[in-house]
């Protein structure tokens, strides 16, 4: 697992505890909360990150205030169960034995039930729409420049293969980034679109998960791109199963 050897840290995940106690004195990093070893050469899975967030020091919440243009945090924080690969288990339950099924990004996709609730498989989120509204600027950004900058960001910062950034739409002041990744398209070693979207979301909030890197400094041809609202939509390979009561509420 690639970790910065000199002072033994995890460049891609600050919510880790690292020590030079791996084979041959190599630096090894484990995620807070789960204690699972993480690969510091790539993004950590969203499940392990959410679990780490629940057991992080209080300082992680009190000393890192979201930036002034941060989105409202409605990401439904909970302490998830992750499988040995760090993915969300299909069924999640809380301490009061209320259970529900989630998709591959940990978002609830069924009504809540009891311990008898069955979630047969982890349904893959294959399409993510990230809606951003940027702060007012003197003029609109050039669409192709904006497109190129956001693709570069996902490729370089989040190591997401360019083929998974399906489109970047722009109608001032709204930007929509489309990420698509079917089960059949995702090869071993490919960053998951759900993980990339989560890192991006935390970056936008001014809560970067990267160790020793400043927050996001998005610029299009030198002009700062400051996001003031973000909404993320998740589309699953199999439609969610909510009761009609919820749909008509």
């Amino acid at each position: 697992h690639t970790a910065a050897q000199d002072n033994c840290t995890c460049p891609t995940n600050k919510m880790t505890v690292c020590s030079p106690d791996g084979p041959g004195g190599r630096c090894q990093c484990r995620a807070l909360g789960s204690g699972m070893a993480v690969d510091c050469s790539t993004l950590t899975s969203k499940c392990l990150l959410l679990k780490a967030r629940m057991s992080a020091p209080k300082n992680a919440r009190t000393l890192v205030r979201p930036s002034e243009h941060a989105l409202v945090d409605n990401d439904g924080l909970y302490d998830p169960d992750c499988d040995p690969e760090g993915r969300f288990k299909a069924r999640q339950c809380n301490q009061t034995s209320v259970c529900w099924c989630v998709n591959s990004v940990g978002v609830r996709r069924t009504d809540k039930g009891d311990l008898s609730l069955r979630c047969d498989e982890l349904v893959r989120t294959h399409h993510i729409l990230i809606d951003l509204r940027h702060r007012p600027t003197a003029g609109a950004f050039n669409h192709s420049d904006l497109d190129a900058e956001l693709r570069r960001l996902f490729r370089e910062r989040y190591r997401l293969h360019p083929k998974f950034v399906a489109a970047v739409h722009y109608e001032q002041p709204t930007i929509q980034i489309e990420l698509r990744q079917n089960t059949s398209q995702k090869a071993a070693g490919d960053v998951d679109i759900g993980d990339a979207a989560y890192y991006f979301e935390r970056d936008i909030k001014g809560e970067s998960l990267f160790q020793g890197r400043g927050g996001l400094d998005l610029r299009v041809r030198g002009e700062p791109l400051q996001v003031e609202r973000t909404l993320i939509y998740y589309l699953d390979e199999i439609p969610p199963k909510f009761s009609m009561k919820r749909l008509t509420a």
Epitope: T9, K14, M15, G212, G214, G215
Partner: antibody, heavy 118, light 106 residues
Framework: QVQLVQSGAEVKKPGASVKVSCKAS????????MNWVKQAPGQCLEWIGI????????TYNQKFQGKVTITVDKSTSTVYMELSSLRSEDTAVYYC???????????WGQGTTVTVSS | DIQMTQSPSSLSASVGDRVTITCQAS??????LAWYQKKPGKAPKLLIH???NLQTGVPSRFSGSGSGTDFTFTISSLQPEDIATYYC????????FGCGTKLEIK
């Protein structure tokens, strides 16, 4: 290699102010928090406050609120701590210390002695 | 505010001895405790973080244990160069140091 280099010793009169600097090199400056710690003669180490260089946010130990102001100059990768209305009890060695990802202090400056004497 | 009670405040031991220092937090701090070594005229040096994780380059004779409110720092076989003052630091909720343990050679 990470280095935190602090400004030199200061001798000040009661009521005056002093500004101590801490210049960072060897790693991303905005990627880590910076802290100030006080050690008065024969006393315990005391945490003074923290700054997030990326956003400029500060949090202070209540005991030092109103006494200390921590600022940052990103262009020179330097953090400053200003002590105002100096009194004899402000005589101490002041250290800057970098906060790692989980906030414990992994690298320290060499310390700056501030002496308050009439 | 979290208080850290460190003991003993000073201790004298012989080269090769096993030395133990304790730190008690006034409330649960999980495992968010670090240990530092400070020599006169020098800056503190990080030895251990997250209760038991040795910082790179720190000799394995140093170790830490504990969780919640009670923590222990151990030097398994005291060496002459270990003469210093040792401090604990809680970094769960803001930051509080213990008042230090001055270690001397008998």
């Amino acid at each position: 290699q990470v280095q935190l280099v602090q400004s030199g010793a200061e001798v000040k009169k009661p009521g005056a102010s002093v500004k101590v600097s801490c210049k960072a090199s060897g790693s991303s400056f905005t990627g880590y928090t910076m802290n100030w710690v006080k050690q008065a003669p024969g006393q315990c180490l005391e945490w003074i406050g923290i700054i997030n260089p990326y956003q400029g946010d500060t949090t202070y130990n209540q005991k030092f609120q109103g006494k200390v102001t921590i600022t940052v100059d990103k262009s020179t990768s330097t953090v400053y701590m200003e002590l105002s209305s100096l009194r004899s009890e402000d005589t101490a060695v002041y250290y800057c210390a970098r906060g790692a990802g989980l906030y414990y202090f992994d690298y320290w400056g060499q310390g700056t002695t501030v002496t308050v004497s009439s | 505010d979290i208080q850290m009670t460190q003991s003993p405040s000073s201790l004298s031991a012989s080269v090769g001895d096993r030395v133990t220092i304790t730190c008690q937090a006034s409330q649960d701090i999980n495992k968010y405790l670090a240990w530092y070594q400070k020599k006169p005229g020098k800056a503190p040096k990080l030895l251990i973080h997250y209760t038991s994780n040795l910082q790179t380059g720190v000799p394995s004779r140093f170790s830490g244990s504990g969780s919640g409110t009670d923590f222990t720092f151990t030097i398994s076989s005291l060496q002459p160069e270990d003469i210093a003052t040792y401090y604990c630091l809680q970094y769960d909720d803001l930051f509080t140091f213990g008042c230090g343990t001055k270690l001397e050679i008998k």
